[in-house]
Each structure stands twice: as structure tokens, then as C-alpha cells.
Amino acid sequence: EPPTACREKQYLINSQCCSLCQPGQKLVSDCTEFTETECLPCGESEFLDTWNRETHCHQHKYCDPNLGLRVQQKGTSETDTICTCEEGWHCTSEACESCVLHRSCSPGFGVKQIATGVSDTICEPCPVGFFSNVSSAFEKCHPWTSCETKDLVVQQAGTNKTDVVCGPQDRLRHHHHHH
């Protein structure tokens, strides 16, 4: 009876276990009892990344600059091209088929993690004692100014969006306070 299974680097065809084509090559003709599988290298801008019996190689991915994409790693006969996004943009999916502008953190929020080519900016609310008064993709929350270290007093309390306002100490009040 003919074989029903083959080894891992083989495939079953016409009751024969034929060798698969190596990565970077495509199938031209199946083996016979007396001839080996015939394979041919993939052309320029084509690839196959597994042991295979494909009759056509896959086209390398095109990194479309109109979608904000650029080449991160050039493809070979065995690997696909890897795209990434232009500076200031990040991929919308794992496959990186298009890009979107990094989000900015609004006033009252600071950057927890700066965006990369594949991940967006992560913002966090500024906690008590910190503020952010700008919309930015890079700025963290800044600590309120310490009036005391400047020998000044707080004239206006800070918020998550504004710094404290320091002013000179009231001399009279300061004097009476000490007497």
C-alpha cells in the first residue's frame, strides 16, 4: 500500500515522499522515483520563509511612504521586509500596515512612556505636587516649584496644570511672627 505519511521535510505526492524546497526557493517540479524535487530560488523582491512546496514566492512587503512607512529591515529570499513608521508616528497594528501620529499628553497629563515605532505615547495624570501646562508627546509631569528653598512663600497654589506662584515673604508678618 502507498505511504500515508512522510517525514517533516518531505511532502506526499503521487504515492511518493518528495523533499520540500528549502526557504528561499519555490517548487518547479515534484520528485519521481528517479528524479529529485526541482526547486528554484525566489526572484528579487520575493521570499519564502519555510520549507515549502509553493509554486510562487511571496512578494516582499512594500513600505509605502504615503502611509508614513519606511523600511526597518530589508527582505531577503528567506525573509519578508519589515516596515516601521517615520519619526513621530507609530504602527496601527502588529503587521505595521499603516501609521498614525503619536498622541500628545494634554495639560494635566505627563508622558509616562515615550512612543516608539510600534507603540503609542502612554500618558498619566499628574499627581499632587506635579503639573504639566503643555500638550506634548515628550514632557513628563514637572514637580511644583519649592518656594521654601528660595526663601519665598506660596502666593498661589499649584494644580495639575499650573505651577505654584511664589512671592516674597511679608516682612511685618514675618517680624511679628518671630516676636
Epitope: R7, E8, K9, T35
Partner: antibody, heavy 127, light 107 residues
Framework: EVQLLESGGGLVRPGGSLRLSCAAS????????MNWVRQAPGKGLEWVSY????????DYADSVKGRFTVSRDNSKNLLYLQMNSLRAEDTAVYYC????????????????????WGQGTMVTVSS | DIQLTQSPSSLTASVGDRVTITCRSS??????LAWYQQKPGKPPKLLIY???SLEGGVPSRFSGSGSGTDFTLTISSLQPEDFATYYC?????????FGQGTKLEIK
């Protein structure tokens, strides 16, 4: 050092069962296809069974089909041969052997061979 | 199933002799053939794979040739350690099969 060590052999009555084990060391066991091959006393080699690296694909010699089951546990680096309904003609030294795929990137020679063998375990089926 | 027939079944030769063992397949197997050496009480040892490729560490006096249905194993100059039994095996398709063996004895 790349090594295979069989165990589980012994004397068993006809109709009985036995489970052979093969412990692999010194290589990434889960990346290799494996085989069982036996040799009756004073006789030649007889291929018994095959299992793919994942355990998904198995095949058997006609003489043991339906009675023997090959399996593997890649997390423990172990290969097994469950032998049921044993017969006198199953008496043999049982070897586990590693299948290796020799790959020449020039594409001239892609071929299989069994490059690593255990020392064997003796199975005797007798009443 | 594919049958492999080895010849001769046994062979007597002297140190320094050139020896050829043949293996014939019942159907074409391209170059999917391996040769093994086995000594008493020991497991087989792979010598040749893909009909003609020498396994690493095997002395160059061993060589294999052939394709399709007819294959040969040649030992160019026999050494004392070469006296053993030799088997061919087809790995073309399941069930994998071995030849019946050729016992090489010292004259």
C-alpha cells in the same frame, strides 16, 4: 554528549504488554524526529516506528500496526513505545534512533539518516 | 513496501583489500539511502547518507554511490576495525526498510 538510553525491556508472556522508554540528553530533543528499530537475535535490523518532532505524525511497520504505539514527551526528553498483544516474534533488542535531516544549503543533497542510536533494551516474549 | 536486497550476504576479505557491497531497491528511491556499520553487541553506526555523503567522523576510505534503484558502498582499503555487518536503509518513504545485511569477515 549526545545520548539515547533505552529502558523497560524484560521477559513478558505472549499477549502481554510492555512500555519501553528512551531518555534523550545532550541535544534539543523536541526538534528531532525519532524512530524505534529492532533486531531479533542473530537477525538483521527492522524499522518499527516513527514519530515527528511534535508527535503529530506517527507511522509503523505492518508487523506491529495496531499493537504498538509510539509517543513522546518533549518536556521530559522522553520517547516511548507501548507494546501490546506481544508475540514470540517480537523478541528482539529494541533501539531508539534519532532521525537527522542533512541539509546542504547549495541544495545538492537533502537527506535523512539515523545518526544517534541508543545501546538497546532486550525484550523477550516467551511462555 | 520497498524491498532492499543486499549482495553479497557475506564476504571474506583481507586487510588492504578494496571491497564493494551493493544494495538494490525494488523501486526508485532517488538518493534516499543510508549505509550503517554494526559490530556485535553494539548499535548501528551511520556511515553514509543521501547515497553518497559521508557522515562526519567516518574515515574517507568509505564511499557511497548510486541513485534510483542501484547503490554501492565501497571500502577502498580494508582496516582491521572494518570487519562488521553493513546495512543499507531507504528513507524515501514509510515503512522505512533495511537490507538484510552483509557480513564482512576477515580472511
Amino acid at each position: 554528549e549526545v545520548q539515547l538510553l533505552e529502558s523497560g525491556g524484560g521477559l513478558v508472556r505472549p499477549g502481554g504488554s510492555l512500555r519501553l522508554s528512551c531518555a534523550a540528553s545532550g541535544f534539543t530533543f523536541g526538534s528531532y524526529e525519532m524512530n524505534w528499530v529492532r533486531q531479533a537475535p542473530g537477525k538483521g535490523l527492522e524499522w518499527v516506528s516513527y514519530i515527528s518532532s511534535s508527535g503529530e505524525t506517527t507511522d509503523y511497520a505492518d508487523s506491529v500496526k495496531g499493537r504498538f504505539t509510539v509517543s513522546r514527551d518533549n518536556s521530559k526528553n522522553l520517547l516511548y513505545l507501548q507494546m501490546n498483544s506481544l508475540r514470540a516474534e517480537d523478541t528482539a533488542v529494541y533501539y531508539c534512533a534519532r532521525d537527522v535531516f542533512f541539509f546542504d544549503s547549495s541544495g545538492d543533497n537533502h537527506a535523512y539518516g539515523m545518526d544517534v542510536w541508543g545501546q538497546g533494551t532486550m525484550v523477550t516474549v516467551s511462555s | 513496501d520497498i524491498q532492499l536486497t543486499q549482495s553479497p550476504s557475506s564476504l571474506t576479505a583481507s586487510v588492504g583489500d578494496r571491497v564493494t557491497i551493493t544494495c538494490r531497491s525494488s523501486q526508485g528511491i532517488r538518493s534516499s539511502l543510508a549505509w550503517y556499520q554494526q559490530k556485535p553487541g553494539k548499535p548501528p553506526k551511520l556511515l553514509i547518507y543521501g547515497a553518497s555523503s559521508l557522515e562526519g567522523g567516518v574515515p574517507s576510505r568509505f564511499s557511497g554511490s548510486g541513485s534510483g534503484t542501484d547503490f554501492t558502498l565501497t571500502i577502498s582499503s580494508l582496516q582491521p576495525e572494518d570487519f562488521a555487518t553493513y546495512y543499507c536503509q531507504q528513507l524515501n518513504s514509510f515503512p522505512s526498510t533495511f537490507g538484510q545485511g552483509t557480513k564482512l569477515e576477515i580472511k
